[in-house]
């Protein structure tokens, strides 16, 4: 169950798609990755107030017990709902390889 | 990737399964759920530090640039792995009857 | 704006070799790889390999492999490729290709003009 | 090696016609396909990307639709200038591979 998708924090406050520019050396892959020089990363930043694209009935459970006992349950987490796949040219111990990663880049977002 | 279950910040500090015991009425379930009267939740709980039970390269990535840009890119959040089905006794229009939901209890836990 | 300006065209023997220019400029070189495509009279497109321009990492297609060199001198944006031991079936014309990458994948977006190789005694 | 098969090897149209071409993959290539334009004398142009990405400056008549083996490249008015023979390419392992081009001819 994908609940609602207003944000009651105001505008992009909310869990949502943000993309953050990073380079190999960022990225911790300049002793393995070739190409690209930089990448556009998607990654799921924002809030996940009560209800917000609840993921599920586990979700949904977390917002409540986070309600009455937020020392102890932390409120529900934005991560990714699915990937977009990418392709890396890499080092391999023969040379070079062109290599797709289907779990790389967040394609979208919900919170659990 | 299920990189390194040691946790650095010391024991049951880092992300893994906790059980938090839950009425009906915690849950805001006493409306339309007969039976259990109280739910064990298992829930993903703890921190995320670099690489611990790191669930894919999107969650390597994220641990990355959070060190970098710590204000802007959040640690990795600890989340359900997989879950445990469970059956409610619950009311319908037409009377009760016996559901089961899958996405309902953590059965293990990563970080992404 | 980008542009790929190649050398000129070369008459060769068989078993000598060639080396053609490709001169990169309107974009950072060291930011895009390099393939090169060749094209013999009348057939279709064959690509021959790709390299690096940050860190001169090559990758060569297999029926060139020992035939074939790619460099790049990133002090004049220039990328090159050097094929020996040249027999009448290479006769073609060479074309190198900005190699683009990011999320959206690979992609040759420019082009040189192409230089025609001739093998002929 | 992945082989890209592109069919037809040529097709006769009017302008205005709608044409399809269509490639196929010996194995899944997710949607890392390219398509070309080629005219006589001239080096190749970047049309799609990523299967279905149009490339900047490109007119919206060529689309591209697609993943895994099979892809079409449609052209939906043909006009004048887009004789030309088109090419598929697979990017998605090394070595790259082009299909075989498909010649659009005036009928």
């Known amino acids: 169950a994908r609940n609602g998708d207003h944000c009651p924090l105001g505008p992009g406050r909310c869990c949502r798609l943000h993309t953050v520019r990073a380079s190999l050396e960022d990225l911790g892959w300049a002793d393995w990755v070739l190409s690209p020089r930089e990448v556009q990363v998607t990654m799921c930043i924002g809030a996940c107030p009560s209800q917000f694209r609840a993921a599920n009935m586990h979700a949904q459970i977390k917002t409540s017990l986070h309600r009455l006992k937020p020392d102890t349950v932390p409120a529900p987490c934005c991560v990714p709902a699915s990937y977009n796949p990418m392709v890396l040219i890499q080092k391999t111990d023969t040379g070079v390889s062109l290599q797709t990663y289907d779990d790389l880049l967040a394609k979208d977002c919900h919170c659990i | 990737a299920r990189n390194g279950d040691h946790c650095p910040l010391g024991p049951g500090r880092c992300c893994r399964l906790h059980t938090v015991r839950a009425s009906l009425e915690d849950l805001g379930w006493a409306d339309w759920v007969l039976s259990p009267r109280e739910v064990q939740v298992t829930m993903c709980i703890g921190a995320c530090p670099s690489q611990f039970r790191a669930a894919n390269m999107h969650a390597q990535i994220k641990t990355s640039l959070h060190r970098l840009k710590p204000d802007t890119v959040p640690a990795p959040c600890c989340v359900p792995a997989s879950y445990n089905p469970m059956v409610l006794i619950q009311k319908t229009d037409t009377g009760v009857s016996l559901q089961t939901y899958d996405d309902l209890l953590a059965k293990d836990c990563h970080c992404i | 704006q980008v542009q790929l300006v190649q050398s000129g065209a070369e008459v060769k023997k068989p078993g000598a070799s060639v080396k053609v220019s490709c001169k990169a400029s309107?974009?950072?070189?060291?930011?895009?790889?390099i393939s090169w495509v060749r094209q013999a009279p009348g057939q279709g497109l064959e690509w021959m390999g790709w390299?690096?321009?940050?860190?001169?990492?090559?990758f060569y297609a297999q029926k060139l492999q020992g035939r074939v060199t790619m460099t790049t001198d990133t002090s004049t944006s220039t990328a090159y490729m050097e094929l020996r031991s040249l027999r009448s079936d290479d006769t073609a014309v060479y074309y190198c290709?900005?190699?683009?990458?990011?999320?959206?994948?690979?992609?040759?977006?420019?082009w040189g003009q192409g230089t025609l190789v001739t093998v002929s005694s | 090696d992945i082989q890209m098969t592109q069919s037809p090897s040529s097709v006769s149209a009017s302008v205005g016609d709608r044409v399809t071409i269509t490639c196929r993959a010996s194995q899944g290539i997710d949607s890392w396909l390219a398509w070309y334009q080629q005219k006589p004398g001239k080096a190749p142009k970047l049309l799609i990307y990523?299967?279905?990405s149009l490339q900047s400056g490109v007119p919206s008549r060529f689309s591209g639709s697609g993943s895994g083996t099979d892809f079409t490249l449609t052209i939906s008015s043909l006009q004048p200038e887009d004789f030309a023979t088109y090419y598929c390419q697979q990017v998605h392992s090394f070595p790259i591979t082009f299909g075989g081009g498909t010649k659009v001819e005036i009928k």
């Open positions: 309107g974009y950072t070189f060291t930011n895009e790889g």
């Open positions: 390299i690096s321009a940050y860190t001169a990492d090559t």
């Open positions: 990523a299967a279905s």
């Open positions: 290709a900005r190699t683009r990458h990011d999320t959206s994948g690979l992609r040759f977006d420019y």
